[in-house]
């Protein structure tokens, strides 16, 4: 629903777009470091024409928290990186720190990797809407495409045949799945490709029955699909890589006219565009909001999260395009040289995490960071990561795929 005298219709920059309702993925609670969003929560039409300074908005109350440095999140609820597109290339093991209470990918692993999800392949490559000046209409969110890869009727296990290549992790939705690459990469054509990261928050109206905790529900999958379709429309398939859903949280409606029976969620996302894109944080925000406002849909607003804040870094001239190169904020530190995220100093990764095919993760809520092999590898007696035996995959080679 994108019309209403509301509190969030106007972003800190200038922009717009549109789309329908809900869906997500159950994978692993890949709780990426959460960062403060530079959201401006103002009434739909601000009284001033100049953009207000970005502030954090929780939409649920009038309190405006000050941006907190990114921290590692271990809540197992709706913090699930859900990609919403597909396209990327990785190869290097960026050992970023991730946390998770449970992994709901294809096996009940304890840990979680800092990978970025991406659709295994999308059945429905949605062609970008033509913005033909004087011609057809704006991109409208009427077609709900399922950007899934593996299909089945019930909530089966679409990851059982290990469809994800290039050491990416298969993440299960309802009856589809996507492949999760390392942070900053997106999955495309069976490889993880490096892209440009654009973190943000999108507000979406959902059905009253939507439960952000039910990551295997059809509604969650639909949400994922909707967001993917929107972004694919906005950026086009040549530029769009994928969108990862990090968290889904319910809050009060940003529109002043909405009533209590309207359900509205804030979806924290990371959009990964092709490395060659000329888009920057400002143009990305503007394009998305322009699209949202062009027609009537479930999307309410998109707010930018500064990339440097997302990584926990001090601002740089290039807006922290390289998370590995930026300087951590004073109260944070990089858990290890290969982590793009700066975190609270107590969460330091062991030095051994720099080894090949290793990653840093928190296996238990509140636990200390540990080193583990990336999916597709397991530790041998010497502590080195070796490729899984034929027929096995996933974290610690616990996933047996059917031949």
């Amino acid at each position: 629903t994108n019309q209403g005298n509301s509190a969030d219709a106007v972003t800190t920059t200038e922009t717009a777009t549109s789309g329908p309702t809900v869906a997500a993925a159950d994978t692993t609670e890949t709780n990426f470091p959460e960062t403060a969003s530079t959201t401006a929560n103002t009434p739909s039409f601000p009284t001033a024409t100049s953009p207000a300074p970005p502030i954090i908005s929780t939409h649920s109350s009038s309190t405006i928290p000050t941006p907190a440095p990114p921290i590692i999140s271990t809540h197992s609820s709706s913090t699930i990186p859900i990609p919403t597109a597909a396209d990327s290339e990785s190869t290097t093991n960026v050992n970023s720190l991730a946390t998770s209470d449970i992994i709901t990918a294809s096996s009940p692993n304890d840990g979680l990797i800092t990978m970025v999800p991406s659709e295994t392949q999308s059945n429905n490559e949605m062609s970008p809407t033509t913005e033909d000046n004087q011609s057809s209409g704006p991109p409208t969110g009427t077609a709900l495409l399922e950007t899934s890869t593996l299909n089945s009727t019930g909530p089966s296990n679409p990851c059982q045949d290990d469809p994800c290549a290039d050491n990416s992790l298969c993440v299960k939705l309802h009856n589809t799945s996507f492949c999760l690459c390392l942070e900053g990469y997106y999955y495309n054509s069976s490889t993880c490709k490096k892209g440009k990261v654009f973190p943000g928050k999108i507000s979406v109206t959902v059905s009253e029955t939507f439960d952000p905790e039910e990551k295997h529900s059809m509604a969650y999958q639909d949400l994922h699909s909707e967001i993917t379709s929107l972004f694919k429309d906005v950026f086009g398939t040549s530029v769009y890589g994928q969108t990862v859903i990090l968290t889904v949280s319910t809050s009060l409606s940003p529109r002043s006219e909405m009533r209590a029976d309207d359900k509205f969620v804030n979806v924290t996302i990371v959009t990964i565009l092709a490395e060659t894109t000329s888009d920057n944080e400002k143009t990305v925000t503007e394009k998305i909001n322009k699209a949202i406002r062009s027609s009537s849909s479930n999307f309410l607003n998109y707010d930018l999260t500064l990339r440097c804040d997302y990584y926990g870094c001090n601002q740089t001239a290039d807006d922290c395009l390289n998370g590995l190169a930026c300087d951590c904020k004073s109260d944070l530190q990089r858990p290890n040289p290969q982590s793009p995220f700066c975190v609270a100093s107590s969460l330091k990764c062991p030095d051994a995490c720099n080894a090949q095919h290793k990653q840093c993760l928190i296996k238990k809520s509140g636990g200390a960071p540990e080193c583990a092999c990336v999916p597709g590898y397991q530790e041998d007696a010497n502590g080195n990561c070796q490729k899984c035996a034929f027929g096995y995959s996933g974290l610690d080679c616990k996933d047996k795929f059917q031949l």
Epitope: T1, N2, Q3, G4, N5, S6, A9, V10, T11, T13, E14, T15, A16, S18, P20, S44, F45, P46, T47, T49, S50, P51, E131, N133, Q134, S136, G137, P138, T140, G141, T142, T205, E286, N289, K290, R293, S294, S295, S296, S297, N298
Partner: antibody, heavy 114, light 106 residues
Framework: QVQLQQSGAELVRPGSSVKISCKAS????????MNWVKQRPGQGLEWIGQ????????YYNGNFKGKATLTADKSSSTAYMQLSSLTSEDSAVYFC???????WGQGTTLTVSS | QIVLTQSPTIMSASPGEKVTMTCSAS?????IHWYQQKSGTSPKRWIY???KLASGVPARFGGSGSGTSYSLTINSMETEDAATYYC?????????FGSGTKLEIK
């Protein structure tokens, strides 16, 4: 508060052109699509098209292609609609509107008569 | 394009009476929006996103529906409700309006 102030009534000759204006205030003009709607006397509403002032992007109802041209001036927060080759069929009240938040101008009455 | 058919075209109701008017879309739309227009004035947004009342709209009004079938209801007609009501979709381009339902007071 938000206001959309339209230009005054016009009486023009058939075959000529006219440019109607809609001055916006109270919101970020360049970030919301401006729509134009036609209403003939005693008739219903008909969508003409929309313009995104931020970059000038436009979409038209096919029935109005070649008839209406939408433009916007960000510096003055004003949207314009030019109607060309006017006939008596173009006699109507024309509204500018921001559908997103439900704001409408007061309407401009256009009379085409010889 | 999506055609919106409103019915009835004209109706009258006595004060206190319940009023229902419908809007049928030729194909499915995400949301329907309703406008109230009185003679010589611009349309006012009345109900948006199918069921949300615009600012200042009395609680006796309601909207519902999904897909291709939508309706506007007044629980208890009042004199000031006499007007023409238009439904609109702007989910799909070109955006379209219904032909209107004229509501008169008996």
């Amino acid at each position: 508060q938000v206001q959309l102030q339209q230009s005054g009534a016009e009486l023009v000759r058939p075959g000529s052109s006219v440019k109607i204006s809609c001055k916006a205030s109270g919101y970020a003009f360049s970030t919301y699509w401006m729509n134009w709607v036609k209403q003939r006397p005693g008739q219903g509403l008909e969508w003409i098209g929309q313009i995104y002032p931020g970059d000038g992007d436009t979409y038209y109802n096919g029935n109005f292609k070649g008839k209406a041209t939408l433009t916007a001036d960000k510096s003055s927060s004003t949207a314009y609609m030019q109607l060309s080759s006017l006939t008596s069929e173009d006699s109507a009240v024309y509204f500018c509107a921001v559908f997103w938040d439900g704001y409408w101008g007061q309407g401009t009455t256009l009379t085409v008569s010889s | 394009q999506i055609v919106l058919t409103q019915s009835p075209t004209i109706m009258s109701a006595s004060p206190g009476e319940k009023v229902t008017m419908t809007c049928s879309a030729s194909s499915s739309v995400t949301y329907i929006h309703w406008y109230q227009q009185k003679s010589g004035t611009s349309p006012k947004r009345w109900i948006y996103d199918t069921s949300k009342l615009a600012s200042g709209v009395p609680a006796r009004f309601g909207g519902s529906g999904s897909g291709t079938s939508y309706s506007l209801t007044i629980n208890s007609m009042e004199t000031e409700d006499a007007a023409t009501y238009y439904c609109q979709q702007w989910s799909s381009n070109p955006f379209t309006f219904g032909s209107g339902t004229k509501l008169e007071i008996k």
